[in-house]
Amino acid sequence: MRRGPRSLRGRDAPAPTPCVPAECFDLLVRHCVACGLLRTPRPKPAGASSPAPRTALQPQESVGAGAGEAALPLPGLL
């Protein structure tokens, strides 16, 4: 079992290589893959209390990191 990539921790984890526009970053195996290989997100119902639907981020978008951490580009956060 290839376990190495999943053992990277928090601030010690290197930022993923930015994905090209047709690719998304898979957080579980930690590399860029074709966006079509990741599950299609389901739309959130109107008025849902969660602000974080599983939608693919564009390559220029990022997920906010904790205080003092650089935001990491994570296209394909599903």
Epitope: M1, R2, R3, R6, S7, L8, R9, G10, A13, P16, D26, L27, L28, V29, V33, G36, L37, L38, R39, T40, P41, A52, R54, V63, G64, A65, G66, E69, A71, L72, L74, G76, L77, L78
Partner: antibody, heavy 117, light 111 residues
Framework: EVQLVESGGGLVQPGGSLRLSCAAS????????WNWVRQAPGKGLEWVGY???????YYNPSLKSRFTISRDTSKNTLYLQMNSLRAEDTAVYYC???????????WGQGTLVTVSS | DIQMTQSPSSLSASVGDRVTITCRAS??????????MHWYQQKPGKAPKLLIY???DLESGVPSRFSGSGSGTDFTLTISSLQPEDFATYYC?????????FGQGTKVEIK
């Protein structure tokens, strides 16, 4: 909506083998992560392993040597091959699908495997 | 392996009560600014149901009385006002590091 239907469970003798199937509809098993999770009677949940979009498999190390996950993309079906079964493998086996942070949002109804002589 | 410890293992509560279940991981389950922590509800004879993903995101279709919080190693599932259909067993799960692991479960029973 994804629907998962497991089959193949039943009674098997210690040392025997069994292959479980999980037929998926509503999404392709060539996308995302497809898991097996088991639950012994009256006990908690235990992750068995997954196969992902690329066919890469990851296993619970305690089970890897005896259990193998595979798929048939033409049938959109996931399999769990279980060998050298022991009494402690008696459980309900579920298949479930994950997004790429691992949460399992769709589950099958489960299939019971009983290992007993 | 990351060990997940839930507390309490069981609790008795009444309809309308506020219920809090905690889950502690043996090491941080955070990465990339995300908590790889999820919560499930399971009723007898049924498959688990996803309630909360990534520590605090409410799954589609789940009532808003369920909420999750926490980061790093300490997480909480809260039911703001317990309803009759909420009596069940609740599990936390981490997917930060292989093998993925679940807590031992918390059974919520009727007082």
């Amino acid at each position: 909506e994804v629907q998962l239907v497991e089959s193949g469970g039943g009674l098997v003798q210690p040392g025997g083998s069994l292959r479980l199937s999980c037929a998926a509809s509503g999404d392709s098993i060539t996308r995302g992560y497809w898991n097996w999770v088991r639950q012994a009677p009256g006990k908690g949940l235990e992750w068995v392993g997954y196969i992902n979009y690329s066919g890469t498999t990851y296993y619970n190390p305690s089970l890897k040597s005896r259990f193998t996950i595979s798929r048939d993309t033409s049938k959109n079906t996931l399999y769990l091959q279980m060998n050298s079964l022991r009494a402690e493998d008696t459980a309900v086996y579920y298949c479930a699908t994950s997004h790429n942070t691992g949460e399992m949002d769709y589950w099958g109804q489960g299939t019971l495997v009983t290992v007993s002589s | 392996d990351i060990q997940m410890t839930q507390s309490p293992s069981s609790l008795s509560a009444s309809v309308g009560d506020r219920v809090t279940i905690t889950c502690r991981a043996s090491e941080s389950v955070d990465d990339y600014g995300i908590s790889f922590m999820h919560w499930y509800q399971q009723k007898p004879g049924k498959a688990p149901k996803l309630l909360i993903y990534r520590a605090s995101d409410l799954e589609s279709g789940v009532p808003s009385r369920f909420s999750g919080s926490g980061s790093g190693t300490d997480f909480t599932l809260t039911i703001s006002s317990l309803q009759p259909e909420d009596f069940a067993t609740y599990y936390c799960q981490q997917t930060s590091k292989d093998p993925w692991t679940f807590g031992q479960g918390t059974k919520v029973e009727i007082k």
